[in-house]
């Protein structure tokens, strides 16, 4: 007796998970037998090559490699989502359609979200090493492994919970170099190896020596720059201070620094850098041209001990390491009007009292230079017959001025009637393509 | 079109507790990332709970660890903030995100507004 | 856990000029692969924010091509080459570089 389609197996989600071929099956039932079509995203697909696809005489679908992937709202759908399959079973009686069924290729991106850190665990006690894997698709899994070896997990004593390696009761045998490993069908990822040294108790409690603990910030000086690190690096400073207290001392050190604000103003927060010694150690990242606050407190495990007084250290200015940006000149009624955008702020080196601007020998203008005080970034400058005019721009601080924008040129034609400054859509003209115009 | 609604706010004591959700749609939540934002009164962006794209893996500020809770159901593509033993500075407009990967919240819902006093 | 300064907090601006946004982190938003997460978001008056521009200088769809973000390592700039009347609000730099989090204060911008 004749009967409509009935989808009897649906096609399930699946992985792509190539050399070999994805296969997506449906099944239906009906009188007569059903013809099966595949659609992707709601269109019917051609089956003829190159498309990748092919029909089993059964009905699956066989995709040889990835489809061509149309636009998505963002990577994340691009990189993972090859779309939804849907089959439809058809007699003279009538059609079924299957379930959707998403077809995603797996991803395991690089960069973990919390990497594990060196520490150090006392015998007996309980020590846990973060690990935030990489986003993946599909959600990665994570073991440990120690010294180069998969962890063996004893009930009781280790438990992984999202990510972390809880350790119940610290061993001397719990020494070791360890690491994050995760993995789902695309690979795997190791994190950094994190160091675990492990103590024996002490017989004083940490945190009430750590609160004896007195640090006396000594010295804050001024690190002359590295020339390995290139001509503009970024100021260091080195942090001297002296421990009493206790015998016991802190395992580790750091700095606490902000720049200082206007009198009276809200502190900025405190950046916090751990710092590599016990009596004095260097401090990088800073910034010139601005006052800086440090203190110094020790810690020891999860433990913090009393900051130590607050120094205080100007940072010179120092010349701006960039130019200006994006100088341009355009003709006005017997003027020219050079403006221009300030270097990155990253490039400032203090505070940016003003510019300098120079007029070019060889042009119409007469060498000359004007200084433009605060923070104005244009000027206005007359101009009495027609010809080239170029200039360069330099950003001042108070240590002098910095490095000049490359020469930026415009030439005036015959009465002002029209300004050239753009030859061939290239932006502003450039001395040279200048000079070779006027041969011309 | 992606859209995503939180719900739950209101007025809760101190030490209470407060359960918001935000309900997603337009795309396949399964597969993303999300995360909580709040923002108190008049002033900026905090971030307070990530979750990944299965629930297994959780992310927290010191601000917030050890009272406050992120979850998801991903069959109803719902995500969830458990807020216990609130404080007044927990007060604050609080918005769901989704990520992209973990690098960027793309989009976000309007939010609800959760304040704590007594 | 890494601070996020921006400058200036407050910048009134002229209709068609640019406008320019720092902001700076306490340590390096580059991790060990090189790669950098900071992202520029817009909040509108009475609005949630809106993505502008992730990973430094990528603009997020739909975002007009007069934003655009460049930097590295500890300094991050958001550039407005005209700057229109609907772009006033609260501009953030958010850091996902490091767990935790951290936005910047904001800067508001408006017009003079």
């Known amino acids: 007796q004749d009967s409509p389609p009935q989808i009897l197996v649906h096609p399930q989600d699946q992985l792509f998970q190539g050399p070999g071929p994805a296969r997506m099956s449906c099944q239906a039932s009906g009188q007569p037998p059903p013809t099966i079509r595949w659609l992707l995203n709601g269109q019917p697909l051609s089956m003829v090559p190159p498309d990748p696809h092919h029909l089993l005489p059964d009905g699956t679908l066989l995709l040889l490699q990835p489809p061509a992937r149309g636009h998505a709202h963002d990577g994340q759908a691009l990189s993972t989502d090859l779309g939804v399959y849907t089959c439809e079973a058809s007699n003279r009686l009538g059609t079924a359609v299957s379930r959707g069924a998403r077809l995603s290729v797996a991803v395991l991106r690089e960069d973990f979200q919390i990497q594990p850190r060196d520490m150090v665990a006392v015998v007996g006690e309980q020590f846990t090493l973060e690990c935030g894997p990489p986003w993946g698709h599909p959600e990665p899994t994570v073991s440990w492994w120690k010294d180069g070896k998969p962890l063996a997990l004893q009930p009781g004593r280790h438990t992984v919970s999202g990510g972390s390696l809880l350790m119940a009761r610290a061993e001397k045998s719990d020494e070791g170099t360890y690491m994050c490993v995760a993995t789902n069908s695309a690979g795997h990822r190791e994190s950094r190896a994190a160091r675990v040294s492990i103590q024996e108790p002490q017989d004083y409690t940490e945190p009430v020596e750590l609160l004896a603990v007195r640090i006396q910030l000594e010295n804050v000086t001024l690190l002359n720059p590295d020339p390995a690190e290139g001509p503009k690096p970024r100021p260091a400073v080195w942090l001297s201070w002296k421990v009493s207290g206790p015998a016991a001392p802190a395992q580790s050190y750091t700095a606490l620094f902000r720049t200082q604000t206007a009198p009276g103003g809200q502190g900025a927060p405190w950046a916090e850098e751990l710092l590599a010694g016990w009596q004095s150690a260097e401090l990088g990242g800073l910034h010139w041209g601005q006052d800086y606050e440090f203190k110094v407190r020790p810690s020891s495990g999860r433990a913090r001990g009393p900051d130590s007084n607050v120094l205080l250290l100007r940072l010179p200015e120092k010349v701006p390491s960039a130019p200006p940006q994006e100088v341009t000149l355009k003709p006005g009624n017997g003027t020219v009007f050079v403006s221009w955008v300030p270097p990155p702020a990253e490039n400032h080196n203090g505070i940016i009292r003003g510019y300098q601007v120079w007029s070019l020998g060889n042009t119409s203008l007469p060498p000359a230079n004007w200084t433009v005080v605060g923070e104005q970034t244009q000027l206005e400058i007359a101009t009495h017959m027609p010809g080239s005019y170029c200039v360069q721009v330099a950003a001042v601080t108070g240590a002098g001025a910095g490095e000049p924008s490359r020469p930026v040129c415009l030439l005036l034609e015959q009465a002002m009637e029209r300004a050239t400054q753009e030859p061939s859509e290239h932006g502003p003209w450039t001395l040279e393509q200048l000079r070779a115009t006027l041969k011309r | 079109e992606v859209q995503l609604v939180e719900s739950g706010g209101g007025l809760v004591q101190p030490g209470g507790s407060l359960r918001l959700s935000c309900a997603a749609s337009g795309f396949t939540f399964s597969t993303y990332a999300m995360s909580w934002v709040r923002q108190a009164p008049g002033k900026g962006l905090e971030w307070v709970a990530t979750?990944?794209?299965?629930?297994?893996?959780?992310y927290y500020p010191d601000s917030v660890k050890g009272r406050f809770t992120i979850s998801r159901d991903n069959a109803k593509n719902t995500l969830y903030l458990q807020m216990n033993s609130l404080r007044a500075e927990d007060t604050a407009v609080y918005y769901c995100a989704r990520l992209i990967y973990y690098d960027y919240l793309d989009y976000w819902g309007q939010g609800t507004l959760v304040t704590v006093s007594s | 856990d890494i601070v996020m300064t921006q400058s200036p907090l407050s910048l009134p601006v002229t209709l068609g000029e640019p406008a320019s946004i720092s902001c700076r982190s306490s340590?390096?938003?580059?991790?060990?692969?090189?790669?950098?997460?900071l992202n520029w978001y817009l909040q509108k008056p009475g609005q949630s924010p809106q993505l502008l521009i992730y990973r430094v200088s990528n603009r997020f769809s739909g975002v007009p091509d007069r934003f655009s973000g460049s930097g590295s390592g500890t300094d991050f700039t958001l550039k407005i080459s005209r700057v229109e009347a609907e772009d006033v609000g609260v501009y953030y730099c958010l850091q996902v570089t490091h767990v935790p989090w951290t936005f910047g204060p904001g800067t508001k911008v408006d017009i003079k």
């Open positions: 340590q390096s938003l580059e991790n060990s692969n090189g790669n950098t997460y």
């Open positions: 979750i990944s794209q299965g629930g297994t893996y959780t």
